[in-house]
């Protein structure tokens, strides 16, 4: 057993059918000795009496909140929440896994740019009695600083029966160099909490390796006199990082016709322009990529032939 | 990625083109690795990020942007000094800090060309002959260095008398290719840089 | 005292189906995963699927997977798998098991696929 | 496709030490913990050893698990006729849980 937070533990239970579970003593916070007795949540079955009690935690109608009281009076509460190891793999009940990049991945980080700002999110089909609590470090020996905000519902789904919620947290390092080399990973905790049970996420990545660039902006045709062709140009996204001589993009331009079968042609370039064929109905999108270090390719920003 | 390779310019800063296929041979080789040595811990997420040029040289430090010494957080800087005389200076007004700059980044590449030879030989004896250097990124190290050509006292291969321990030594490849590409991204940035400004 | 009790099993033509059935006891069934388990005559243990407590997840076996349906009755305490477009190479014991450090297994039910 | 390779049969006489080898990688063995079960013929597989080498109640401590980088064993010290039986060891995948992941099998005789 081990405290959360204040007056509010995880007890730690190895799930199988016919387990012994864990003893847990509770002790009533009180100078008070005598006539101190024991309920759990709204019941008022007394299950023992005096400061302290020892209970037997093996399922969850044994979890939930013990208070102490006396002579009706409320002394102190425990709040017991049950973490659930099942065959030596802690229980990953409440989040959805989204085997993105690969199986078993359910928290999912992004950065627009090397600043040390990056974005998690994660995806649950709960929608009540549930909390979300995050921590970040960089490195877990001799932590450094990351500051996290608190973790919101970004978005809903409908995913054929089932609603599916989304939820989202903004993190920053405390001192972060765009420039520097990384030897650290980031480490991102989140302790969910649904109902009585508890469970813990965890990644870890590199910055390098989660970014992600905004789509180019002011993406802009010019047609060539006496041609099909066309001049795209476009601008580096304001979120990038700067200098742009040092933090450079590369770019990959695409003209893509109205039917999703028909040949897409592609070019990629390392400038801010470049010169293609511009059919009836086609569209030509624009998307980024840090030139050096192969992450992943920004969203395609896109405008019309015509 | 399979982009076109852009030729540079004549006029170009002579260092940027040398420090591309460094990139693109360090990226190959680190491939190549990953996949033949697939049974071994070689990928990002399980080996340690060991920086062997670590309190030799201060590459991201001597050749930061202007634009990023006003952020305190990249400013931790390590005292070093250099030789000064390199011939991707040549045609240029050059300030002492980007001297110091290619002057670490040719540091680097010396220390990592030594570590990379030393293991080379350890692993042609092994039995198994299941990776070398690839003999391409051998040469793009030397062909970068020899156009920063400074001038610098030539450290000596190191040479084990005990039995190479093939499985360490391996792992230790793994190690050092991908600490070698993150500095040979870093260096891309930098003539990138450089070449701009 | 924990027990599964199982049943379905049968000789079944190739491209029929069956459903096994295992009923659990001395638990409450409705707080753990289950799994099904085969073993083909004279060979080893392969794992078949898994099912959350709550019915919610479900894993499959490629070897299976679109053919076959775990499913569970939290109020009957039942596991069932249902096996559609049965192949000669689904012959086989077919186990239910609980998740857990300490499992318990069903008494086994053979089922066999054959013209 | 079974990715635990176990030896098909290993044998000695009563009193002896048998070991029984279970080797994975680093994904499943080298990331999770090892079962080893006991199977005698027509009947359901008996846990033997749980969290690489932990015995559950009523396990004679005869039998013994071990977990090392990326493989696992099982030893019987003192080997008695009755232990003559097909052992399995069960991993998972980091990637692939809960799908179990048994070993080949490994049968053993106790020979005289």
């Known amino acids: 057993i081990w405290e959360l937070k204040k007056d509010v533990y995880v007890v730690e239970l190895d799930w199988y059918p016919d387990a012994p579970g864990e003893m847990v003593v509770l002790t009533c916070d009180t100078p008070e000795e005598d006539g101190i007795t024991w309920t759990l949540d709204q019941s008022s079955e007394v299950l023992g009496s005096g400061k302290t009690l020892t209970i037997q935690v093996k399922e969850f109608g044994d979890a939930g909140q013990y208070t102490c009281h006396k002579g009706g009076e409320v002394l102190s509460h425990s709040l017991l929440l049950l973490h659930k190891k099942e065959d030596g793999i802690w229980s990953t009940d409440i989040l959805k896994d989204q085997k993105e990049p690969k199986n078993k991945t359910f928290l999912r980080c992004e950065a627009k740019n090397y600043s040390g700002r990056f974005t998690c999110w994660w995806l649950t089909t709960i929608s009540t009695d549930l909390t979300f609590s995050v921590k970040s470090s960089r490195g877990s020996s001799d932590p450094q600083g990351v500051t996290c905000g608190a973790a919101t519902l970004s978005a809903e789904r409908v995913r054929g029966d089932n609603k599916e919620y989304e939820y989202s947290v903004e993190c920053q390092e405390d001192s972060a160099c765009p420039a520097a080399e990384e030897s650290l990973p980031i480490e991102v905790m989140v302790d969910a909490v649904h109902k009585l049970k508890y469970e813990n996420y965890t990644s870890s990545f590199f910055i390098r390796d989660i970014i992600k660039p905004d789509p180019p902006k002011n993406l802009q045709l010019k047609p060539l006199k006496n041609s099909r062709q066309v001049e795209v140009s476009w601008e580096y996204p304001d979120t990038w990082s700067t200098p742009h001589s040092y933090f450079s993009l590369t770019f990959c331009v695409q003209v893509q016709g109205k039917s999703k079968r028909e040949k897409k042609d592609r070019v990629f370039t390392d400038k801010t322009s470049a010169t293609v064929i511009c059919r009836k109905n086609a569209s030509i999108s624009v998307r980024a990529q840090d030139r050096y270090y192969s992450s992943s390719w920004s969203e395609w920003a896109s405008v019309p032939c015509s | 990625r399979n982009l076109p390779v852009a030729t540079p310019d004549p006029g170009m800063f002579p260092c940027l083109h040398h420090s591309q296929n460094l990139l693109r041979a360090v990226s190959n080789m680190l491939q190549k690795a990953r996949q033949t040595l697939e049974f071994y811990p070689c990928t990002s997420e399980e080996i340690d990020h060991e920086d062997i040029t670590k309190d030799k040289t201060s590459t991201v430090e001597a050749c930061l942007p202007l634009e990023l010494t006003k952020n305190e957080s990249c400013l931790n800087s390590r005292e070093t000094s250099f030789i000064t005389n390199g011939s991707c200076l040549a045609s240029r007004k050059t300030s002492f800090m980007m001297a110091l700059c290619l002057s670490s980044i040719y540091e680097d590449l010396k220390m990592y060309q030594v570590e990379f030879k030393t293991m080379n030989a350890k692993l042609l004896m092994d039995p198994k002959r299941q990776i070398f250097l690839d003999q391409n990124m051998l040469a793009v190290i030397d062909e970068l260095m020899q156009a920063l050509n400074f001038n610098s006292e030539t450290v000596p291969q190191k040479s084990s008398l005990e039995e190479p321990d093939f499985y360490k030594t391996k792992i230790k490849l793994c190690i050092l290719l991908h600490a070698f590409r993150i500095r040979a991204v870093t260096i891309d940035r930098v003539m990138s840089y450089l070449n701009a400004s | 005292q924990v027990q599964l009790v199982q049943s379905g099993g049968g000789v079944v033509q190739p491209g029929r189906s069956l459903r096994l059935s295992c009923a659990a006891s001395?638990?409450?069934?409705?707080?753990?995963?289950m799994h099904w388990v085969r073993q083909a005559p004279g060979k080893g243990l392969e794992w078949v699927a898994f099912?959350?407590?709550?019915?919610?997840?479900?894993y499959y076996a490629d070897s299976v997977k679109g053919r076959f349906t775990i499913s569970r009755d939290n109020s009957k305490n039942t596991l069932y798998l249902q096996m559609k477009s049965l192949r000669a190479e689904d012959t086989a014991v077919y186990y239910c098991k609980t998740h857990g450090s300490h499992d318990n297994w069903g008494q086994g039910t053979m089922v066999t696929v054959s013209s | 496709s079974y990715v635990l390779t176990q030896p098909p049969s290993v044998s000695g006489t009563p009193g002896q030490r048998v070991t029984i080898s279970c080797s994975g990688g680093r994904s499943n063995i080298g990331s999770n913990t090892v079962k080893w079960y006991q199977q005698l013929p027509g009947t359901a597989p008996k846990l033997l050893i749980y969290?690489?080498?932990q015995r559950p109640s009523g396990v004679p401590d005869r039998f013994s698990g071990s977990k090392s980088g990326t493989s696992a064993s099982l030893a019987i010290t003192g080997v008695q006729a009755e232990d003559e039986a097909d052992y399995y060891c069960q991993s998972y995948d980091r990637y692939t849980h809960p799908a179990l992941l048994f070993g080949t099998g490994t049968k053993v005789t106790v020979l005289g």
């Open positions: 001395g638990f409450t069934f409705s707080s753990y995963g």
């Open positions: 099912i959350r407590y709550d019915g919610s997840n479900k």
């Open positions: 969290g690489n080498d």
